[in-house]
């Protein structure tokens, strides 16, 4: 799996989606998990509704958010509040019994607020010894923004 | 106006099967989902299970997992709960109820009269 | 399955008094709670959704309140209609009931 780079500013929500194929998945209840470690395991975040065709609803763990379009093949989740220990790898995971299939690896990066004065350098970036040749970044950043604000450009 | 129609009481005998029937009318009926509740006398409500009378996939409570079958016929916006192998346990008001929702929220908004099930030898 | 605890699970008041009837989760719910009235040989009618949205229709003497695990639903006045049986239901999980309170005439 190739990894997907989403973006969000500190303090603000952003959105992961995770699309799949949704006669592939029909009635598999998803996930959204932690990546510990390069070869550790993956630890279950949040996951969609226990009953699958209740999948729309959106379910919160702490600040973080599961929602499942089953119909359109798309998994959304919400990092509410985004704070710099929440960047780093994750999974969106196709549950099945015990079993679990990786939709997609998303790999959040936690961007500085430019509105936010205070000193960045806690701010997480994959460091340069990491290798993601293969990731693809989705610019995420999910403020609205004011009438007459300059949008912050956002690193790659 | 919207509606759900219960087919009329019955009287089973242990080990038997009860098919109870609930007929929408009102609205669009693959719109939206159908649950079925029970009451048993003087007791609380029970959630049953759920039916998505659009594709008719379904999702059962554990407890009653092998043992009742949701069904729909939708050329007559209707739906269908079966239990089988049913005992005295089993004597209760069966309702039928429209399932309303979206992301953040989600309830019952119309419920049938019910459908007294009575099992005794 | 997610159980849900109501207190108290009958009251004696009277027409005009402002009833309270609690309803707890096992577990965090978020607000994903409603509540349903009932009357002897009577379906369950729907008063509240997620929490603290009145069902249309519904008079605004019902309100309901809470978050997380602990749920409130409030009759501010109460009317001779509202002698029932309430129920709180959670859909965080698979559907599961309260035990439900009996509003009983003092």
């Known amino acids: 799996h190739n990894t997907t780079v989403f973006q969000g500013v500190a303090g603000q929500s952003l959105q992961v989606s995770c699309p799949y194929d949704s006669m592939k998945h029909w009635g598999r209840r998803k996930a959204w998990c932690r990546q510990l470690g390069e070869k550790g395991p993956c630890q279950r975040v949040v996951s969609t509704h226990n009953l699958w065709l209740l999948s729309f609803l959106r379910r919160w763990n702490g600040s973080t958010a599961i929602t499942d379009d089953t119909l359109g093949g798309t998994l959304t989740i919400t990092l509410r509040n985004l704070q710099p220990h929440d960047a780093g790898l994750y999974q969106c995971q196709s549950l099945h019994g015990s079993e679990a299939d990786t939709l997609r690896k998303v790999l959040v990066e936690v961007l500085a607020d430019p509105l936010d004065h205070r000193d960045a350098g806690d701010l997480w970036f994959p460091g340069e010894s990491e290798s993601f040749e293969d990731a693809h970044v989705e610019h995420s950043i999910s403020r609205s923004l004011l009438e007459g604000e300059i949008p912050f450009p956002p690193t790659s | 106006q919207v509606q759900l129609v219960q087919s009329g009481a019955e009287v089973k005998k242990p080990g038997a099967s009860v098919k109870v029937s609930c007929k929408a009318s009102g609205y669009t009926f693959t719109s939206y989902y159908m649950h079925w509740v029970r009451q048993a006398p003087g007791q609380g409500l029970e959630w049953m299970g759920i039916i998505n009378p659009s594709g008719g996939s379904t999702s059962y409570a554990q407890k009653f997992q092998g043992r009742v079958t949701m069904t729909r016929d939708t050329s007559t916006s209707t739906v269908y709960m079966e239990l089988s192998s049913l005992r005295s346990e089993d004597t209760a008001v069966y309702y039928c109820?429209?399932?309303?929702?979206?992301?953040?929220?989600?309830?019952?908004?119309?419920w049938g009269k019910g459908t007294t099930v009575t099992v005794s030898s | 399955d997610i159980q849900m605890t109501q207190s108290p699970s009958s009251l004696s008041a009277s027409v005009g008094d402002r009833v309270t009837i609690t309803c707890r989760a096992s577990?965090?719910?978020?607000?994903?709670l409603n509540w349903y009235q009932q009357k002897p040989g009577k379906a369950p009618k729907l008063l509240i959704y997620a929490a603290s949205s009145l069902q249309s229709g519904v008079p605004s003497r019902f309100s309901g309140s809470g978050s997380g695990t602990d749920f409130t639903l409030t009759i501010s006045s109460l009317q001779p209609e509202d002698f029932a049986t309430y129920y709180c239901q959670q859909f965080d999980d698979v559907f599961t009931f309260g035990g439900g309170t009996k509003v009983e005439i003092k």
């Open positions: 109820a429209r399932g309303v929702g979206g992301q953040d929220y989600y309830y019952m908004d119309v």
């Open positions: 577990q965090s719910i978020s607000s994903y």
